[in-house]
Interface confidence: low
């Protein structure tokens, strides 16, 4: 004959444990039912009555089977630099992620605690490493033969065009200008191609410090155009 199924509450065998979705109530000394996600324990079990569960109130949740007396509060509303990617429901907390063009400088268990704007590389500098959801853009000076004339968190250094006759030589922040004869594209030295970010936001493995500067300050645009030839004093 099959073993008899015990209904909660029941006393476990000596040294035994309660079954899945049950917990051992120390006061009643019985195995009792847990409450499902979206509910909490309104009345704890006794030797003769099982746990009484109730739905979570608005703006509260439980994500797991539980026997908590109160549901957890959902996190505060997403800030202006974030978007809500998961709403607060009875079964899950609100999740806020950084909006496009920003990255998460300070993570929390789920979502992001603090967003910071992605660094923009100034003219003369290109993206060496795109930002990611949790890391800032890394800029690098454009190597000889390459340039970037934009202030951008996605643009890389591009090769100068090669002219039959050069009107104006290129530098790190400006392409070469050719006379009327048609130019050809150079194969510039050094790596100039870089994978573009998966999205505008998904672009520092750089160990993501908290933002080293307040949003919107000029310091987020780290370094500027063409480095000098060795020994020059700049402009």
């Amino acid at each position: 004959l099959p073993a008899q199924v015990a209904f909660t509450p029941y006393a476990p065998e000596p040294g035994g444990t309660c079954r899945l979705r049950e917990y051992y109530d120390q006061t009643a000394q019985m195995c009792c039912s847990k409450c499902p996600p979206g509910q909490h324990a309104k009345v704890f079990c006794t030797k003769t009555s099982d746990t009484v569960c109730d739905s979570c109130e608005d703006s509260t949740y439980t994500q797991l089977w539980n026997w908590v007396p109160e549901c957890l509060s959902c996190g505060s509303r997403c800030s202006s630099d974030q978007v809500e990617t998961q709403a607060c429901t009875r079964e899950q907390n609100r999740i806020c992620t950084c909006r496009p063009g920003w990255y998460c400088a300070l993570t929390k268990q789920e979502g992001c605690r603090l967003c910071a704007p992605l660094r923009k590389c100034r003219p003369g500098f290109g993206v060496a490493r795109p930002g990611t959801e949790t890391s800032d853009v890394v800029c690098k000076p454009c190597a000889p033969g390459t340039f970037s004339n934009t202030t951008s968190s996605t643009d890389i250094c591009r090769p100068h065009q090669i002219c039959n006759v050069v009107a104006v030589p290129g530098n790190a922040s400006m392409d070469a200008v050719c006379t009327s004869t048609s130019p050809t594209r150079s194969m510039a030295p050094g790596p100039v191609h870089l994978p573009q970010p998966v999205s505008t936001r998904s672009q520092h493995t750089q160990p993501t410090p908290a933002p080293s500067t307040a949003p919107g300050t000029s310091f987020l645009l780290p370094v500027g155009p063409s480095p000098p030839a060795e020994g020059s004093t700049g402009d």
Partner: nanobody, 120 residues
Framework: DVQLVESGGGLVQSGGSLRLSCAAS????????MTWVRQTSGSVFEWVSD????????RYADSVKGRFIISRDNAKSTLYLQMDSLKTDDTAVYYC?????????????WGKGTLVTVSS
């Protein structure tokens, strides 16, 4: 006349330390973003670190993070780069450069550089 003069470079054993200084004059140092950039033997320029005017905000390249510390003394108009646990890869000419804020975000002023050689 704008001047940026780097000093403190030299030959050092791998694992050793150096402190670079950059004495600035001729522009409003205390309101300028300051940057260290290095040029390797292959003529590749690499941004190393930068610091905002009040010295509270700093950034570092991955390759130097945890080993280099950028700082400044506005009263002396001097920028510093403390370099510890040096590696042979750190061998380069180190330039300090300034963004005085009026330049549209470019590094308008550059020093002549100081050579750092790290031997194994």
């Amino acid at each position: 006349d704008v001047q940026l003069v780097e000093s403190g470079g030299g030959l050092v054993q791998s694992g050793g330390s150096l402190r670079l200084s950059c004495a600035a004059s001729g522009f409003p140092f205390s309101s300028s973003d300051m940057t260290w950039v290095r040029q390797t033997s292959g003529s590749v320029f690499e941004w190393v670190s930068d610091i905002n005017p009040d010295g509270q905000n700093t950034r570092y390249a991955d390759s130097v993070k945890g080993r280099f510390i950028i700082s400044r003394d506005n009263a002396k108009s001097t920028l510093y780069l403390q370099m510890d646990s040096l590696k042979t890869d750190d061998t380069a000419v180190y330039y300090c450069a300034a963004d005085p804020g009026s330049s549209g975000g470019s590094l308008s002023y550059w020093g002549k550089g100081t050579l750092v050689t790290v031997s194994s």
